[in-house]
Each structure stands twice: as structure tokens, then as C-alpha cells.
């Protein structure tokens, strides 16, 4: 899975007469050129990272240290792109006093490149600075990605604190953090779940309303109507259910679902879906109940190849 190709940001419509605006335009054009070059460099480097990761899988003992090396190389490389992106975004938004609180805000300010952004802290909303991945392309864009599974390099069998704060690599596999997701869903929000199986088929599920309650309410999940092509709604069973982790059992079960399903999730008793389950590779992907499952599509024993969960405001207009 390559990282998304980066597009030139759309230019805002401004009077041509204004020198200041012309200067800004020139800055953006320049930054866009730099971005394109870095994007090309990134794709080449990504191939070498993938090769390293594949190598890692067959070298048991050296896996951890080599993985760290590969990840830090990739991170370093992407940091350059992040700086360029953020400068581009700031160039476009400096003149506006509107708060940037999610990816849809950035989209509305004409930032149209999918990738990593650092959302500024907001004292009024009580939200800290947050690094997010924005999907500016899917179905009009403006999506803040809250979860991704694609490489299997990050364990999702984590404790309450880690699920609260978030973990993983923002460009790879990650959980944004329940506290952040809760804050982002305080306004009316949509949820989109995208899935890919091991045959390369892609499906999605979308929910007209998505709320994650606060920690006091155990990050309970509330969902609106389902639409999509991922078969039967496999999140309905988890609706109005508290979040559980291996060290905090909030499920409706005599068994500890988080321990049985090896993840943190809105476990009922136990699953119709388990998007934070164990990442199983091809060959092992259809043998386990604790995988990344979506019952409505491939059943209870099929672990998916890729999953992404993303949110945006209900009233978002591309």
C-alpha cells in the first residue's frame, strides 16, 4: 500500500490586483513544487522501506531493531514533507481567524492534499495540539482518520490508557485515541469505515451519526443509520456499548471479550466486528476469531487486509 499521491492545493479565488495575495500565490506554487519533488522521492524511499519490512518478517531475532530503523528512516523522510505541507496550509490560513479543529476545517480553507497535519491546540474547545492524517479525496474529502490497519506492524492489544491517548504511526497503523475521538465527535459527525479483503476487494460502511461519549461513560459508542456495501451492518451489535480493553472490562459478557478478541473495542458479547483485532497475514487470515473481522462481509473468522475508520462533520459540504 503506497502512501497517497500528493496533489497541488487548489488556489483560493482572490482579487488579482492585490500584491500581497500575488506573493502568497507565488509562495504556495513554490511549496507545491517542493511537495511534488518530495512526493516522488517519498515513493522511491517507500519501496525500499517495504523491502526492509518484508525482510524483517523472515528474520525473527533482528525484527524489532530493524523495524525501528526502517520506521525512523520513513519518519525522518516524511517529516520533511510534513513541514512543507504545514507551511502550505499556514500560508493559506494565516489571514483567517477561524479555528482549525479537524480535517474538514483544513479542507474548507482550500487545503486539498491528503496527508499528515498538526492541528493547533484550542483552549476554547479544550483540545490539545494533535497530529492527524487527513483524507482529502474520498467522497469529497475532509475526513479525519481515527484508525488504520494496513501493515500489521503495530499491536492493538493495548491497555485503557494507551487507547485513551492513542498509539501507533500516523502514516501506518494507529489508533488516534479515545479522548481525541470523543472531542472530535462532539459536533454532529459521520463515520466511514473502509475495508479491503485479501482478494483486493474494497467495501465501505457509513454511519449518518457517530458519537463517542466521554471517559466517565467509558467512551460508549452511539451510531446512526448505516449505509454502504459491506454487507449487513456489523457495528449495530456494538452500538450503545462501552469501550473495553484488556485491563478494563466493560462488555456485556461473562467472558472478558478484550482478552478473547485481543484488542480494544466496543465489545458486546463479543463481536460482529473487531476492527482493532489481531492483524493476520494471508494464509492465516481465515483461521482465527480474534482477527480484524467484519461479520457482515466475510464472517467471523476472516481477518481483513486493510481497514480505515474516518470521521467528518455531518454538515460537511465539499
Amino acid at each position: 500500500q503506497k502512501p497517497p499521491k500528493r496533489k497541488t492545493p487548489a488556489q483560493p479565488k482572490v482579487p488579482a490586483c492585490c500584491e500581497e495575495v500575488q506573493e502568497l500565490k507565488a509562495q504556495v506554487a513554490n511549496l507545491s513544487r517542493v511537495l511534488s519533488e518530495l512526493g516522488r522521492k517519498q515513493e522511491k524511499d517507500w519501496v525500499s522501506v517495504v523491502m526492509q519490512v518484508m525482510e524483517l518478517e523472515s528474520s525473527g531475532k533482528r525484527m524489532e531493531s530493524r523495524l525501528t530503523e526502517a520506521e525512523s528512516k520513513y519518519s525522518e523522510m516524511n517529516n520533511q514533507i510534513d513541514i512543507m505541507q504545514l507551511q502550505a496550509a499556514q500560508t493559506l490560513t494565516q489571514t483567517s481567524a477561524d479555528a482549525i479543529y479537524d480535517c474538514s476545517s483544513l479542507y474548507q480553507k482550500n487545503y486539498r492534499i491528503s496527508g499528515v497535519y498538526r492541528l493547533p491546540s484550542n483552549d476554547f474547545l479544550g483540545s490539545p495540539e494533535l497530529e492527524v492524517f487527513c483524507d482529502m479525496e474520498t467522497k469529497g474529502g475532509g475526513w479525519t482518520v481515527i484508525q488504520r490497519r494496513k501493515s500489521g506492524l503495530v499491536s492493538f492489544y493495548r491497555d485503557w490508557k494507551q487507547y485513551k491517548q492513542g498509539f501507533g504511526s500516523i502514516r501506518g497503523d494507529f489508533w488516534l485515541g479515545n479522548e481525541h475521538i470523543h472531542r472530535l465527535s462532539r459536533q454532529p459527525t459521520r463515520l466511514r469505515v473502509e475495508m479491503e479483503d485479501w482478494e483486493g476487494t474494497v467495501r465501505y460502511a457509513e454511519y449518518s451519526h457517530f458519537v463517542l461519549s466521554n471517559e466517565l461513560n467509558s467512551y460508549r459508542l452511539f451510531l446512526g443509520n448505516y449505509s454502504g456495501n459491506a454487507g449487513n451492518d456489523a457495528l449495530y451489535y456494538h452500538n450503545n456499548t462501552a469501550f473495553s480493553t484488556k485491563d478494563k472490562d466493560n462488555d456485556n459478557c461473562l467472558d472478558k471479550c478484550a482478552q478473547l478478541r485481543k484488542g480494544g473495542y466496543w465489545y458486546n458479547c463479543c463481536t460482529d466486528s473487531n476492527l482493532n483485532g489481531v492483524y493476520y497475514r494471508l494464509g492465516e487470515h481465515d483461521k482465527h476469531l480474534d482477527g480484524i473481522t467484519w461479520y457482515g462481509w466475510h464472517g467471523a473468522n476472516y481477518s481483513l487486509k486493510r481497514v480505515e475508520m474516518k470521521i467528518r462533520p455531518e454538515d460537511f459540504k465539499p
Partner: antibody
Framework: EVQLVESGGGLVQPGGSLRLSCAAS????????MSWVRQAPGKGLEWVSA????????YYADSVKGRFTISRDNSKNTLYLQMNSLRAEDTAVYYC??????????????????WGKGTTVTVSS | DIQMTQSPSSVSASVGDRVTITCRAS??????LAWYQQKPGKAPKLLIY???SLQSGVPSRFSGSGSGTDFTLTISSLQPEDFATYYC?????????FGQGTKVDIK
Amino acid sequence: EVQLVESGGGLVQPGGSLRLSCAASGFTFSSYAMSWVRQAPGKGLEWVSAISGSGGSTYYADSVKGRFTISRDNSKNTLYLQMNSLRAEDTAVYYCAKVERDMVRGHYYYYMDVWGKGTTVTVSS
Amino acid sequence: DIQMTQSPSSVSASVGDRVTITCRASQGISSWLAWYQQKPGKAPKLLIYAASSLQSGVPSRFSGSGSGTDFTLTISSLQPEDFATYYCQQANSFPWTFGQGTKVDIK
């Protein structure tokens, strides 16, 4: 043969305490969740409490929460119900039951497949 | 808490009759329903679990159906030993709850 035998019932004054025991045999006790159900004279069944096989998860009916404690000793194949601050309305026959688990499509279904004969608890002054 | 409501509360029937007892949950419980039979002075006995699965050793004249909120226990041909009280019970979420019972007696 799977068997459950309750004991420890009797007459107790309001505010008093009692500990019920349930001795299990004929199955691997530690592998199964267990439950207590009661039946007041002339009334229907009321679920009281349940405990997982390891003893790590416990659940209670609102009517007994904070007063009753379910526990188990897997080395002795015994289930317990410690009843404190007893009230007249706790008067009932108390049954212990083995909880069986079935799994369909990733969901666990629980049901009480074997029951003891019951022990009578009377709370009266 | 999920409320379970059985109907009728009692039914008079003859040997050979088909008897149907219904149980309604106050909210959806998928198929998390069990049916028990209890005779006077005896412990309850499991008949049906997961709404429609027949417990081992239970005669095939007993059957269960339903999903969500509405469930049915059917005795296709009533036998003398079937005169008893029947309870439905949900295990969808804690606290587990029983219906108030349906007494089947001789007409």
C-alpha cells in the same frame, strides 16, 4: 454425572448474614461460569448473580448489589454466595446453576443448563 | 434493565393440544433467549437456548423461535408430563432477567 448441591440456607434475622455454598462435581468446574437464581415463595424466578470461570468477572442484580458477593474456589469445586444485610424480601429458595456457553458468529450465548435442587433462606424476626 | 413479558400468564390445555407461549423483550436481544420448565417443588430445567436450539435430552415436541424482541415456545403435542410453569430468560445483557412465567395446566 454433572451435579450441583447447595447448602448453607436457614433462618436468619433481618440485617443478618448467611453464606451459601454450592458443591460441583462431574465437570471441569474452573472452565464454566456459574450463577445463583432465587425464587420467593409462590413467585417466579429471579436471577441474582453470576461469576466467570476464573472468578475475574462478577455480575449482580440491582436488588442485591452491595449486599451480596459471589465467589468461587476452583481448587474445591465450590461456588459461594455471601449474603449480608439480609431483608425479608430475600426470603427464597436459592438455586445454583452451571452456565453453559455457545458461540454463534462471534457472539457468545449463555444459558443455565444444570441446576441444583436449591436451599431455602428465610429472613424473619 | 431489559423487561421480559410472557403471555398468557396461564393456559388450560388438553393432552395432544398444540400450546404456544410468547415472550416479549423490552428491547432487542438478538437470539439471547432461553426457555425453562419448572414443576412444583423442583428446580428449573433448560429446554431451549439461543432462542431455537433444543437442549440435549429434551423431546422434539418442544421448539423455540424468534429473534430481536418477540419469541415463541411451542409444544406441538402436549403430554401429561408437560404440565408445568414455563419461563423465558434473556442473557443479552446484565442483569439477566426472567419472564413472569406461564402456567400450563389441565383443562
